[in-house]
Amino acid sequence: GSERICCPINWVEYEGSCYWFSSSVKPWTEADKYCQLENAHLVVVTSWEEQRFVQQHMGPLNTWIGLTDQNGPWKWVDGTDYETGFKNWRPGQPDDWYGHGLGGGEDCAHFTTDGHWNDDVCRRPYRWVCETELGKAN
């Protein structure tokens, strides 16, 4: 018979994708690189269902997702179209705030403690989630 493809150890399967949930923190760019080295990408949230799934696993923690406007327009790291896709910004966000005094604006998106998205300084260290297609992760 045909063998069932599974996610690697420590990864969680959901709707044909595999997810890995960090327990440490990194800046957005380092988190992005970490996922790439695992043959994955930072999580791309495409529906309420996926949003709830990730939230349930991460709990109420600031968590980087694969959405950035460092190059101007908001872009998902896997090329999913931002404009037509699912969005779950916290009210009043994104605001590209400069008042934090860290230099520059806020160019990377993360889950806030209640799951809504916020844009923040990419250098801040937050937890992160990697995602890949079933069978692709290292």
Epitope: Y82, P91, P94, Y98, G101, G103
Partner: antibody, heavy 113, light 107 residues
């Protein structure tokens, strides 16, 4: 494609107010702050401030504080910049701009008695 | 406020020549610097952001470099359509500020 279309040229007398509009299309209006920049004829560019279309929050440079008001109407994806107590040295082209690259065509405001 | 000083204020160049414009910030701005091109009677056009990243659709003749306080934009081989005024702009913090501009014209 992204477009920022501004209202037409205005002629005002000193002491009056002007309200310039900037209609956005081709992107999610609430996902990006709208900046306003002006250019006095023959001079360089001068940043005036921005508005966050989500909640109407704004940040104005000190030079224009008290005279400028930036607002928006999300239902029609339009940002507005109102400048009051106009003086002759406010004669300039006013531009709206989106982060890193998209600019309106400019609106010439002439202040003359 | 952060002051942005551009040099030279004007530059005459022949087609095909390499042109370099510099911009100095009065304090460190990391790489939060943009370069903007403006031709007479038209709206500004963004060329470069984050000091060295080319805006999509901009010719690879243009390149930017620098970090901290000193930045440059280079046109490797200037073409007729490149004759314009170039501004640097910092977006490290409010208020955003521009250089006074460098006019590049035909020799």
């Amino acid at each position: 494609q992204v477009q920022l279309v501004q209202s037409g040229a205005e002629v005002k007398t000193p002491g009056a107010s002007v309200k310039v509009s900037c209609r956005a299309s081709g992107y999610t209006f609430t996902s990006y702050n709208m900046h306003w920049v002006r250019q006095v004829p023959g001079q360089g560019l001068e940043w005036m401030g921005w508005i966050n279309p989500n909640n109407g929050g704004s940040n104005y440079t000190q030079k224009f504080q008290g005279r400028v008001t930036m607002t928006r109407d999300t239902s029609i994806s339009t940002a507005y910049m109102e400048l009051s107590r106009l003086r002759s040295d406010d004669t300039a082209v006013y531009y709206c701009a989106r982060k890193f690259g998209d600019w309106g065509q400019g609106t010439l405001v002439t202040v003359s008695s | 406020d952060i002051q942005m000083t551009q040099s030279p204020s004007s530059r005459s160049a022949s087609i095909g020549e390499r042109v370099t414009i510099t911009c100095r910030a009065s304090q460190g701005i990391s790489n939060y610097l943009a370069w903007i091109q403006q031709k007479p009677g038209t709206a500004p056009k963004s060329l470069i952001y984050a000091a060295s990243s080319l805006q999509s659709g901009v010719s690879s003749r243009f390149s930017g470099s620098g970090f901290g306080t000193d930045f440059t934009i280079t046109i490797s081989s200037v073409q007729r359509e490149d004759f314009a005024t170039y501004y640097c702009q910092q977006y490290n913090g409010y208020p955003f500020t521009f250089g006074h501009g460098t006019k590049v014209d035909i020799k």
